[in-house]
Each structure stands twice: as C-alpha cells, then as structure tokens.
Amino acid sequence: VPRWRQQWSGPGTTKRFPETVLARCVKYTEIHPEMRHVDCQSVWDAFKGAFISKHPCNITEEDYQPLMKLGTQTVPCNKILLWSRIKDLAHQFTQVQRDMFTLEDTLLGYLADDLTWCGEFNTSKINYQSCPDWRKDCSNNPVSVFWKTVSRRFAEAACDVVHVMLNGSRSKIFDKNSTFGSVEVHNLQPEKVQTLEAWVIHGGREDSRDLCQDPTIKELESIISKRNIQFSCKNIYRPDKFLQCVKNPEDSSCTSEI
C-alpha cells in the first residue's frame, strides 16, 4: 500500500539533488583554492540536516546554522553585487569582472542555485514529487528559508560601495517583496556601507528614459537614505554594450554612455 504523501503546489526536489550538491561542492573547492579546506561531505551532512525529517513548512534559519558555519568564506566586502529579477546578466557580469561577487559566486549560493529541495516530517526521505510553493503553501519552506538566510548574511558582510543590478523592464523595478527588497536592503550595515549604487538595466533598444526617476527607485532611495546609507543610480541603456565594455574597457566606443 503506497504511503499517503503530502501534495504541495510547487515542483519537487531537483532530481539527483544529493549528488548535485556534493559534486558542486567538490568542483567549487577545486576552483577556489581558499576553500580547499572545506570538507564537502560535512557540507552535505549539514545541508541534509537542515531539512530532512522536518516538516517542509516549519523550517527555521537556525536549521541552516551548521551549513552557514561550514560554508562561511572570505569575500571582499567592497566587491559585492546584489541583483533583483536579473540574475543572468548579474552572473555574466561577475564572470567577466572576476573581482566582483554575487551570492551565487560564493560556495553556498553556488551549491543551491536553481535547485529545489524538501523533505517530509518524521521520515528520512527526500520529496521528489512536490515541495511547498512560497505563495500557495508556506513561506517557511526549505528553499525560501535557505535563500533568506544566505542573503541576509551576504548583505551583512558588505561594505563601502555596494552595487545592485535591477531589471528596468519590470513594472516594479524595485520590488519590496523581492529577496533584495525584503532581506538584503534591510541587512546592509550603515556603519560599514557608505553607498548603495543601483544599476537599472534597460530592456528595449530605443528606451532612452531615465529609469532612475521611476517611483519604485525613489522608494528604494528613501528606504536606503533612512538607513543612513547614500544612494546613487545609473541607467544601463545597452546591457550588451555594457558587458562588452567590461570585457574590453579600452574600446573607443566605451567612453560614451552605455
């Protein structure tokens, strides 16, 4: 008789999840010499321990504490790039500008990027059928709590000038309900962070509007200013050219506005 299993609204755990996490950890520690001391089996044990045998709507940041501890790493605090709703371009940027880091360039972010996972209460099984959806089921699910936890720590570590890439094609360029808007903005430390610089990425070729004047950007500026952090904003009118100029800053066409 098949055991009754909770049906959630979201997709189930990514197939081969344990193998993927372990393989990513090994690959990351091989590429990053400063993380060679990390024991990937321990990292997996800590990851697994955060959600296995626990109700997937009752996960806490404390559950992830061992993983946070084992995965702590040194990231230059003045080289942090946050992003919201524009992950691909942010990652393309840090792949070129190697001295800057998104969360997914850190070990913990790299391990979990684009993966889904959850367990079941009182069994050691991973649920590959379905996992809770943040909106339809519950917010305290393993994936959401993980990203909230690592995002908070990442923002807390930032210093000097922090950059954030925002999607100018969206109706809410700055969304208070995004991870950036609800977690990272509120965990930047005013005693360490001098300025938040927003890069608003334009979508349309002929879009010459100043999206830094968008009401949601003004809202972001207000939130940041109230936290005693300076705010600046730049339009990136041509993201393709922007990336090209990051690769080849000497190019003559890179002196004009991008």
């Epitope: 400063e34 993380m35 001391h37 024991d39 321990s42 044990d45 800590a46 321990g49 404390e62 504490q65 061992p66 501890k69 084992l70 702590t72 790493q73 040194t74 990231v75 605090c77 720590r153 807390e156 570590a157």
Partner: antibody, heavy 117, light 107 residues
C-alpha cells in the same frame, strides 16, 4: 603544525576591562572560525562566541553579549577578546580554539584572568 | 539552549577495561558532536569530531558513535594516560554547549 598562542595571565580590578590575544600559526588564519571558551573550577566549559577572521563575522552566546567583544587582525593572524565591566564572576581561564566541523580542533594554552580588588 | 547531559559524572575503572561515556542532547543535533579530553592542569584536546571521526593523532582505542540525541564515547583497553575529565559539545545551534564532564579515575 597548527598553534594558538595566547597572551599571559591578567590580574585586574573589578569594573575595569581586559583584552587578551590569540596568535595563530601553521594554517590560513582567514579560513577558520576562532572559538572562545571560558572555564571556571566547578563550572565546566562555557562557549562565549566565535569570529570568522576572513569576513569579520561574529556570533555570541547571549549570556556574553555586552561582556565580550571579539575582533581579529588578519595582518598579524591574531584574534582578540575584550571583557568589560569585570566582576569576580569573570575570574576564569579563557581559551581560544580553532573551529573544525563545528567542533574545536586545536586549543590555545589559555589566559588566566583574576579579578580582585 | 540545547542541554547536553553527560553520564556518568565520575567513573572508576581498571587498566585494560573498556569504558563508555554517554551524552544526551535535549534536541536533535544530527552528527554535530565533539568529544574532548582534559587532563588535570592541562588544556582540553579534541578526540572525536562529527560524532565518530577520530581527530589527528588520537589513539584508535578511542571511538565515538551516535546521531540525533544519543552519543557515546568508548575507550577500549584503558591506559594510565587516559586519566582525565571528558566533555561532549554540540555544534548544531548557538550557543554551543558542553556536557558537565565525566571524571575518569583508575581503580
């Protein structure tokens, strides 16, 4: 080999502060947590808090918040703990140790603090 | 805070004996348990990490087992140099907490 060398014994007056050091050698200082532990006779071992020198992350036992302040200087591979508003209850041996798999694999020789008027 | 209940608090055994010390956590700590030995007048030394892994240089007569809430440290073929107090410590959640210690004496 991994070594943690702690500063010498301290005899201090009540109400004052003390700052002790823990110099690390034999490993990459910025890659491991430094743990701080208090030991008083008859009281066993008490975890005070820890610091990750590479990122300046710190975590404290609630009991020691406001009492202990942890810092680190990466240029000299040295961790520091400052204890403030000292009372007789703070008389103890204080150890630093290196974190490993959520345990503590190498310990300093300890710094004895005696609070007396 | 997670309580670590260690038993017995003291233990007397003969050379060559096998002894067991237990540590019970007040909540699930997975495998995040360390065992330490502290000889009189000395510093604590790590014996076992992650419940069952022997730290570098520790004799193989020491072994650890358990996960979740119940853990044991076993010393087989007791030697005179094993006279010490033994502590367990959980690393699952802050604040890290230690057991009260087990004082081992030789009969």
């Amino acid at each position: 080999q991994v070594q943690l060398q702690q500063s010498g014994a301290e005899l201090v007056r009540p109400g004052t502060s003390v700052k002790m050091s823990c110099k690390a050698a034999g490993y990459t200082f910025t890659n491991h947590w430094i743990e701080w532990v208090k030991q008083r006779p008859g009281h066993g071992l008490e975890w005070i808090g820890d610091i990750f020198p590479g990122g300046g992350y710190t975590d404290y036992n609630e009991k020691f918040k406001g009492k202990a302040t942890l810092t680190a200087d990466t240029s000299s591979s040295t961790a520091y703990m400052q204890l403030s508003s000292l009372t007789s209850e703070d008389s103890a041996i204080y150890y630093c140790a290196r974190g490993r798999d959520l345990a503590m694999d190498y310990w300093g020789q300890g710094t004895s603090v005696t609070v007396s008027s | 805070d997670i309580q670590m209940n260690q038993s017995p608090s003291s233990l007397s055994a003969s050379l060559g004996d096998t002894i067991t010390i237990t540590c019970h956590a007040s909540q699930n700590i997975n495998v995040w348990l360390g065992w330490y030995q502290q000889k009189p007048g000395n510093i604590p030394k790590l014996l076992i990490y992650k419940a069952s892994n022997l730290h570098t240089g520790v004799p193989s007569r020491f072994s650890g087992s358990g996960s979740g809430t119940g853990f044991t440290l076993t010393i087989s073929s007791l030697q005179p140099e094993d006279i010490a107090t033994y502590y367990c410590q959980q690393g699952q959640s802050y604040p890290y907490t230690f057991g009260g210690g087990t004082k081992l004496e030789i009969k």
